[in-house]
Interface confidence: low
């Protein structure tokens, strides 16, 4: 199916930038792995590079505004032609859920005191209003609550006295613009101004005097310029050559606003002075190689020795990585393919251990399934031997750092009937539903 092709993918926002054009296939658009595409306007933007996980979204608002609730965040597998770690297809969402608390307590309503006495009438003649008030302290609200209803109420009051008002003109308004902005049109240009009998309006009962004179004034406009001539476009010029040597590019045509040239302040030509077209070199762009993540460290050994485990004898271990994805004469991966370090082997060594403090509460699992829970642990942590942290393996090569390697067998006193891990679990509260944010925007 045809897609919209873009020249950039913005990692921070996940948006496509620099629209190249539509109606091209994903395969053609992704001849350049720096490009990105959308299957429809406003849809999910996917970069052409090999898939990897996006950054985590910000945490959604807490599912409740007071007391303990939960909140979600997500990340998305973005890219083309492959899978993210965990063998996940592009477009897939991964969720995390955690507990949250915006405000410890929930608001409680207050109650009103009794109404106070009525205040005097707001006017000394004709009809006005009078007001009485009450206090929100019976009881006072708690934790940001309030009292239902109004703190004051008003009612009409009549002084039984009549107020006559005579009309007076407000100031003249501004002259309206001339009815034509240039001479040579069909009607004689005129300007008008008005005023309102509203400073004040005359009363009806007893009747006030109306304003004397007219509410409108007119006069002729003078000194207007000649009427403007609108500009018109000349023909389109030749198409520029394709500016790229691989993938898709853009060519351009130009035209000039001179057919006729705008005169006497007439508007410039409407529309664009340039237009663009997609050009296709049909040549794939070079793709640089990228290092895979490092592999596992090999076992810690020393040449000519069967085992150095549980002994103060330094050995060596290595790990490797693979340069993947290089195509069409792209750059090779920079740096070393193999990494070597010195090590002490504590594989399967019985070591004295001590119980750790409680870990922080983990994420709620499953984030999108039924009845998610969170957990924290105390671990039996091994006490590492006090072997020298550096060694000199070869004369003249200086000191080398030595790392402990392997999975020891720590021994702790039993805690709650456990020897290695003590775990505490709790249910997660007020759990929101997992919804694809792209689908919510539609």
């Amino acid at each position: 199916d045809p897609v919209l092709c873009f020249t950039q993918y913005e990692e921070s926002s996940g948006k496509c930038k620099g629209l190249l054009g539509g109606g091209v296939s994903v395969e053609d658009c992704c001849l350049n792995t720096a490009f990105a595409y959308q299957k429809r306007s406003g849809g999910l933007c996917q970069p052409c590079r090999s898939p990897r996980w996006s950054l985590w979204s910000t945490w959604a608002p807490c599912s409740v505004t007071c007391s303990e609730g939960s909140q979600l965040r997500y990340r998305r597998c973005v890219g083309w032609n492959g899978q993210c770690s965990g063998k996940v297809a592009p477009g897939t969402l991964e969720w995390q859920l955690q507990a949250c608390e915006d405000q410890q307590c929930c608001p409680e309503m207050g109650g009103w005191s009794g109404w106070g006495p009525w205040e005097p009438c707001s006017v000394t003649c004709s009809k006005g209003t009078r007001t009485r008030r009450r206090a929100c302290n019976h009881p006072a609200p708690k934790c940001g609550g309030h009292c239902p209803g109004q703190a004051q109420e008003s009612e009409a009051c009549d002084t039984q006295q009549v107020c006559p008002t005579h009309g007076a003109w407000a100031t003249w308004g501004p002259w309206t613009p001339c009815s034509a902005s240039c001479h040579g049109g069909p009607h004689e240009p005129k300007e008008t101004r008005s005023r309102k009998c509203s400073a004040p309006e005359p009363s009806q009962k007893p009747p006030g005097k109306p304003c004397p004179g007219l509410a409108y004034e007119q006069r002729r406009c003078t000194g207007l310029p000649p009427c403007p001539v609108a500009g018109g476009w000349g023909p389109w010029g030749p198409v520029s050559p394709c500016p790229v040597t691989c993938g898709l590019g853009q060519t351009m045509e130009q035209r000039t606003c001179n057919h006729p040239v705008p005169q006497h302040g007439g508007p410039f030509c409407a529309g664009d002075a340039t237009r663009t077209h997609i050009c296709n070199t049909a040549v794939p762009c070079p793709v640089d190689g990228e290092w895979d993540s490092w592999g596992e460290w090999s076992p810690c050994i020393r040449r000519n020795m069967k085992s150095i485990s549980c002994q103060e004898i330094p050995g060596q271990q290595s790990r490797g990585r693979t340069c993947r994805g290089r195509k069409f004469d792209g750059h090779r991966c920079a740096g070393q393919q193999q990494d070597i370090r010195h090590c002490y082997s504590i594989q399967h060594c019985p070591l004295k251990g001590s119980w750790s403090e409680w870990s922080t509460w983990g994420l709620c699992m499953p984030p999108c399934g039924p009845n998610p829970t969170r957990a924290r642990q105390r671990l039996c942590t091994p006490l590492l031997p006090k072997y020298p942290p550096t060694v000199s393996m070869v004369e003249g090569q200086g000191e080398k750092n030595v790392t402990f390697w392997g999975r020891p067998l720590p021994r702790c006193e039993e805690l709650q009937g456990q020897k290695l891990v003590v775990e505490e679990k709790r249910p997660c509260l007020h759990v929101p539903a997992c919804k694809d944010p792209e689908e919510e925007e539609l």
Epitope: T176, C178, S181, S194
Partner: nanobody, 121 residues
Framework: QVHMVESGGGLVQAGGSLRFSCAAS????????LDWYRQAPGEQRELVAT???????DYAGSVKGRFTISRDNAKNTVYLQMNSLKPEDTAVYYC???????????????WGQGTQVTVSG
């Protein structure tokens, strides 16, 4: 393009009544000031009655109390009710709607075609 179409003129005896209407083809009424003008032979065009978008009306002194201007926004129509007609009311009557231009630096006017009223003594 907006067109103003007038109807309702004719010959009438002194002391009689006439009602003009003026319909617009586009919905400009709610944002326009609506005016009725008249032009007697050999005279300047004269503003007879005006109605602003917020409902304020005003009349020339010679017709005050006899003529009434009104509008119907649903029908895009402005009316002029003329009572107690006099021979000096004989003229061609024009309806006019105007608003500010989009940049507020000019005015945009729409005019009716004009209708003859003759009041015989």
């Amino acid at each position: 393009q907006v067109h103003m179409v007038e109807s309702g003129g004719g010959l009438v005896q002194a002391g009689g009544s006439l009602r003009f209407s003026c319909a617009a083809s586009g919905n400009i009424f709610t944002i326009s000031t609506l005016d009725w003008y008249r032009q007697a032979p050999g005279e300047q065009r004269e503003l007879v009655a005006t109605l602003t978008p917020d409902g304020i009306t005003d009349y020339a002194g010679s017709v005050k109390g006899r003529f009434t201007i009104s509008r119907d926004n649903a029908k895009n129509t402005v009316y002029l009710q003329m009572n107690s007609l006099k021979p000096e009311d004989t003229a061609v009557y024009y309806c006019n709607a105007w608003r500010y231009s989009d940049d507020y630096r000019g005015r945009v006017d729409y005019w009716g075609q004009g209708t003859q009223v003759t009041v015989s003594g």
